[in-house]
């Protein structure tokens, strides 16, 4: 399990407890409710991209 206050993830990534791996912060605009997005710098809101036509 991930130790508190540590991060095995590279820059631009954040640990997902749900998926048990590092995930790309770039995916947070598309899936902002993902657990790992809390560990990412504020991501642009989804409306910057036309993800829901």
């Amino acid at each position: 399990e991930q130790a508190p206050g540590t991060s095995p993830c590279s820059s631009g990534s954040s640990w997902s407890a749900d998926l048990d791996k590092c995930m790309d912060c770039a995916s947070c605009p598309a899936r902002p409710h993902s657990d790992f997005c809390l560990g990412c710098a504020a991501a642009p809101p989804a409306h910057f991209r036309l993800l829901w036509p």
Epitope: L19, D24, A26, S27, R49, W52
Partner: antibody, heavy 120, light 111 residues
């Protein structure tokens, strides 16, 4: 190890129907977006359909314009299976159909593909 | 729809040299934070394999001789030094909006 295995392809006459299946293992299937992408020498790689997860907008589906009203994508999270129901098939629907799993954006996991031929 | 134009359509590269493949989008696929362009490698008889995501981030297990760059509408895949196993067709793909689209591919041979 992540594995995606398509089945259901084959030869079908123009106007006919076919249902493709994809079984996924090694992945928390219910959390991943899934797509079908087809490939032919004429059109190259062509995205066909996508289904998102139940927690994101109730498993929203999206389709390429060329297959809207003809193809239906669905998923069964309890069986880790993805489906593509195809109807009113035309010769231009011929190709290799790939099942793909991804969290968002980049298409991480691809199956080996199943071949669909529409011909009389 | 966003059209992705790859160039060249094919190229022959000497072993150990640098290969450069370009992908141009018909509109920007970048925000101030991220670029939504990805690169795939496909070998004969195999499905495409993700190489680079978000323009420059190597997927896990991809050798460091692969690199990606670019933003807005112009993106580049570089391979250096090229190895024999890199013989394949390379595709770009955007995830800016639906429909997701792919480039026409660049077939690379090694001499």
């Amino acid at each position: 190890e992540v594995k995606l295995e398509e089945s259901g392809g084959g030869l079908v006459q123009p106007g006919g129907s076919m249902k493709l299946s994809c079984v996924v293992s090694g992945l928390t299937f219910s959390r991943y977006w899934m797509s079908w992408v087809r490939q032919s020498p004429e059109k190259g790689l062509e995205w066909v359909a996508e289904i998102r997860v139940k927690s994101d907008n109730y498993a929203t589906t999206h389709y390429a314009e060329s297959v809207k009203g003809k193809f239906t994508v669905s998923r069964d999270d309890s069986k880790s299976r993805l489906y593509l129901q195809m109807s009113s098939l035309r010769p231009e629907d011929t190709g290799i159909y790939y099942c793909i799993g991804y969290y968002a954006d980049a298409m991480d996991y691809w199956g080996q593909g199943t071949s669909v031929t529409v011909s009389s | 729809d966003i059209v992705l134009t790859q160039s060249p359509a094919s190229l022959v590269v000497s072993l150990g040299q640098r290969a450069t493949i370009s992908c141009r989008a018909s509109q920007s696929v970048s925000t101030s934070s991220y670029s939504y362009m990805h690169w795939y490698q496909q070998k004969p008889g195999q499905p495409p394999k993700l190489l680079i995501k978000y323009a420059s981030k190597l997927d896990s297990g991809v050798p460091a001789r692969f690199s990606g760059s670019g933003s807005g509408t112009d993106f580049t895949l570089n391979i250096h030094p090229v190895e024999e196993e890199d013989t394949a067709t390379y595709y770009c793909q955007h995830s800016w909006e639906i429909p997701w689209t792919f480039g026409g591919g660049t077939k690379m041979e090694i001499k």
